[in-house]
């Protein structure tokens, strides 16, 4: 039996969008179905339908189909938006270009290349002709519009209106030279959908021919829409998995557009002695890698063979030898002409945020007046009269509007970590600038940490060294995995938000992590039936030099008795000594045959100058700091550990504290831990949550 | 105690393919990864990948695909590694060793080596 | 792939000296370095986790220090039973590297 095509990838996909007509004449066919792909194969065919299929839509919660005559674009029709529904458009009726000969076209471009308009299909004024579109089914010979019904060179053609002139061509584009993109098409969102040797392209939302990682729910950014070439990763140009089962994938023939400028919003800030960001931008003249071996030509082949080209990277400034980061590396490398070594980064170009010398602020910066416009990630800040509406959202007072003039960094909510602006990037709605604290200023911008004045607990509610196996309501635990491994702890503190340490991300590949939920073994046995398993859509890192990291999942996990969340103290907030608290790990607990579990070790709270005194003076404890020691001698988090949490409780409610960090050795005697402080992040955490979109459950 | 008991020395023709074995004993054999590190006299210690016995999961150096291929029988407590189309580059000492659980961790036994010598 | 690059190549020392070995990244590896001892004819044996824990049964002559890209072994006072090579490898990036090894000799 022949295997029926999927056809799905014919069609242009609007979620949570349907369609109602307003002209009641309009026909609709409607049935229960599956899924999409059942809809699709008989929208394609015609199967058993009393007009040519252009539209339908998938009824997710009925698991229905509506097929329609007609599309968007159709008169006597309307948008409308629902959660249960999507709309799926065959794209040769709203493609305004054609691929090969245009046999598939099925636009409405009815006016030949000399401009005369085309004579209706179903008359024989002035020309009679044989192209009856009863004897060509299927091929759309509708009206007066521009058709190919037999595949003919010259592309679509009519019967004009002229009887001086029988037919002639219409002037339709190859869809390859409506389509273009800059530089390398990280950025492009056009709607090729087929490759350049002509192979349509899988949608990115199917797993068949190819199963790939590219989700469009995981990377949101990516504009990984229905089945249309895109650069995700870096690739020399947009490319596509292909519907071929034997041709995995390959990539499309997308002109480089004619003004090969990037927009204002893709164009990283360019610097010539030192790195932004991730040095994107970098564009100076190092050519050595960090420990002075020289870097290889961008040009040659020798002695590392690459395509990282200055021909394949256009916009890159791949010139001569030197250091570029062109790939969205942590910061820019070469190849290098050791042929023993083949990439190395170049650490030691200084980093911008260090070199700002005159500009800086005091206190927490709210009355900073530079003129920087720039996020620390090099993104350009955007104009605070366009955002007054989101500021608004998370402040309850009046700003100051003659301080937010034009797109600078400025701190009007009293940010306690400085000044900050909106980017107009949306996965990214705005970030802090990198300006750092004058020098000298010792402005406390949180008072009194040893005393307590603020309670931690907002209402009166209800791995580890040598810990204790724990399987109490511990449901806000979460395993961060790399690559299939654990490597760090991170509490749910929100169904779609995880608090973690920024250690735990070697690879910037965030395919290359899931967050795993509900467990209580390392390795997820015996918990088959509470483990949630979710992937990593963003990492937000934290206020410089606070080692904290917000993960956003891919999607929100589901509360129930396995998976909570865990409460976040308030602001600026002290515990009183000596209060008992616990981290949990999966990490290193120096047993020879570790059973997996998660485990708990006691600590209670120290103040921060008794704390400096343990550590012989070596270590002076600032505001962002916690300190706890261990009640057990020996026993606190270690490697594996790190991202978790110091638990603690107050007026009967628990609260995560602390995050564990990399530090001093681990459980050593009567050497305390040191944890990043919560409460000194907490605006911060809930400015992110209050601002960054997340995926609807 | 804790031990990892390698096969024994192994003398190959070019071409052909070996399996070195890495038996454990003294701990709970599908919670730990294998690591595989590969040593040439003047080449200092090479990661070549790693297995946890419990699931199968594999991570590989890049340079070691098609290479070396991991596998493990957790009934035997036994760990395998596959080493194909042998070349001369392929002579060395090669150890198993016991990982940790979670990434990053370091490797607490090992075993006492296998050494493979390629020639014709 | 990051590189671990191990200072010196090898050393000679006398019983009761102290010996530094250093070990520097190519990027930033946190604290994820571990210091391997390597006598003649036999297999590595872990001395250091995490870049500044001794392990279990190690001698508190040997201790190492460092975070992100350098880091030290040392050893307080040398012993004849410590001629060895020490190799120091990074477990935070893919693939796992060490460095080429310190050859330490006793005089």
């Known amino acids: 039996q022949r295997k029926r095509r999927n056809t799905i990838h014919e069609f242009k996909k609007s979620a949570k969008t349907t369609l109602i007509k307003i002209d009641p004449a309009l026909k609709i066919k409607t049935k229960k179905v599956n899924t999409a792909d059942q809809c699709a194969n008989r929208c394609t065919r015609n199967k058993g339908l009393p007009f040519t299929c252009k539209a339908f839509v998938f009824d997710k919660a009925r698991k229905q189909c509506l097929w329609f005559p007609f599309n968007s674009m159709s008169s006597g029709v309307k948008k409308e938006f629902g959660h249960e529904f999507d709309l799926y458009e065959n794209k040769d009726y709203i493609r305004n270009c054609i691929i090969g000969k245009g046999r598939s076209y099925k636009g409405t471009v009815s006016i030949t290349k000399s401009g005369i308009k085309c004579q209706p299909w179903s008359s024989m004024i002035p020309h009679e002709h044989s192209f009856l579109p009863s004897s060509y089914r299927g091929k759309d010979l509708q009206e007066n519009y521009c058709r190919n019904p037999r595949g003919e060179e010259g592309g679509p053609w009519c019967f004009t209106s002229n009887p001086e002139v029988r037919y002639e061509v219409c002037d339709i584009p190859q869809c390859s030279e409506v389509e273009c993109m800059t530089c390398n098409g990280e950025s492009y969102r056009g709607l090729m959908d087929h490759t350049e040797s002509g192979k349509i392209c899988q949608r990115w939302d199917h797993q068949t021919p190819h199963r790939h990682k590219f989700l469009p729910e995981r990377y949101p950014d990516k504009g990984f829409d229905d089945n249309y070439c895109r650069n995700p990763d870096g690739q020399p140009r947009p490319w596509c998995y292909t519907l071929d089962p034997h041709t995995r994938w390959e990539y499309c023939a997308i002109k480089t557009c004619a003004d090969n400028t990037m927009n204002d919003t893709d164009v990283p800030l360019e610097t010539t002695e030192c790195i932004q960001g991730q040095g994107e931008g970098y564009r100076g003249t190092v050519n050595t890698i960090w420990n002075g071996i020289p870097c290889q030509r961008w040009d040659s082949q020798y002695p590392h063979e690459h395509d990282m080209t200055p021909e394949n990277f256009k916009c890159k400034d791949l010139r001569e030898n030197y250091c570029r980061n062109p790939d969205g590396s942590e910061s820019p490398w070469c190849f290098t002409t050791d042929p023993n070594i083949r990439v190395g980064y170049c650490s030691q170009i200084p980093n911008c945020d260090m070199s700002h010398g005159q500009d800086c602020y005091r206190g927490n910066g709210k009355n900073y007046m530079g003129n920087l416009s720039q996020t620390r990630s090099g993104l350009t800040c955007s104009m605070w009269d366009k955002n007054m509406e989101d500021l608004h959202r998370h402040i309850f007072w009046e700003p100051d509007a003659s301080k937010l003039n034009e797109n600078y960094c400025r701190n009007p909510d009293d940010d306690a970590h400085g000044p900050w602006c909106y980017t107009g990037n949306p996965l990214i709605p705005w970030d802090y600038c990198p300006i750092s604290r004058c020098e000298g200023d010792t402005t406390p911008t949180i008072v009194n940490l040893d005393h307590p004045v603020i309670s931690c607990a907002k209402t009166k509610q209800l791995r580890v060294v040598n810990g204790i196996p724990t399987r109490t309501n511990i449901g806000w635990m979460v395993s961060l995995r790399y690559r299939n491994k654990h490597i760090c702890g991170g509490s749910l503190i929100k169904e779609s938000w995880v608090l973690t340490a920024r250690q735990c991300f070697p690879s910037r590949d965030l395919k290359d992590y899931e967050a795993w939920l509900g467990i209580h073994d390392v390795h997820g046995r015996g918990d088959e039936k509470c483990k949630q398993v979710l992937n990593v859509s963003q990492l937000v890192y934290g206020p410089e030099g606070s080692d904290l990291v917000l993960m956003k999942l891919a999607r929100p996990a589901v509360l129930d008795d396995f998976v909570s969340t865990i409460d976040l103290p308030n602001y600026g907030c002290t515990i009183p000594e000596k209060t008992s608290c616990s981290v949990y790990g999966w990490g290193y607990t120096g047993l020879i045959n570790y059973d997996g579990l998660l485990r708990v070790a006691h600590l209670y709270i120290m103040g921060n100058e008794k704390c400096s005194q343990h550590h012989r003076g070596k270590v002076t404890l600032n505001e962002s700091e916690i300190c706890a020691g261990a009640e057990k001698i020996g026993s606190g988090p270690c490697e594996g550990d790190y991202g978790g949490p110091l638990v603690c409780e107050q007026h009967k409610m628990r609260m995560v504290l602390g995050v564990i960090v990399p530090g001093r050795g681990c459980a050593i005697p009567n050497r305390p831990g040191i944890f990043v402080r919560v409460a000194y992040y907490a605006k911060w955490i809930h400015k992110i949550i209050l601002t960054y979109k997340v995926p609807q459950s | 105690q804790v031990q990892l008991q390698q096969s024994g020395a192994d003398l190959m023709k070019p071409g052909a393919s070996v399996k070195i074995s890495c038996k454990a004993t003294?701990?709970?054999?599908?919670?730990?990864?294998i690591e595989w590190v590969k040593q040439r006299p003047g080449h200092g210690l090479e990661w070549i990948g790693e297995i946890l016995p419990g699931s199968g999961n594999t991570n590989y150096n890049e340079k070691f695909k098609g290479k070396a291929t991991f596998t493990a029988d957790t009934s035997s407590n036994t760990a395998y590694m596959q080493l194909s189309s042998l070349t001369s580059e392929d002579s060395a000492v090669y150890y198993c060793?016991?990982?940790?659980?979670?990434?990053?961790?370091?490797?607490?036994?090992w075993g006492q080596g296998t050494t493979l010598t390629v020639s014709s | 792939n990051i590189v671990m690059t191990q200072s010196p190549k090898s050393m000679s020392m006398s019983v009761g000296e102290r010996v530094t070995l250093t070990c520097k990244a190519s990027?930033?590896?946190?604290?994820?370095v571990s210091w391997y001892q390597q006598k003649p004819e036999q297999s590595p044996k872990l001395l250091i986790y995490g870049a500044s824990n001794r392990y279990t049964g190690v001698p508190d002559r040997f201790t190492g220090s460092g975070s992100a890209t350098d880091f030290t072994l040392t050893i307080s006072s040398v012993q004849a039973e410590d001629l060895a090579d020490y190799h120091c490898g990074q477990g935070y990036s893919y693939p796992y590297t060490f460095g080429g090894g310190t050859k330490l000799e006793i005089k």
């Open positions: 990027e930033n590896v946190v604290t994820y």
């Open positions: 003294g701990y709970t054999f599908s919670g730990n990864w």
């Open positions: 060793a016991r990982g940790g659980h979670y990434y990053g961790s370091s490797w607490d036994y």
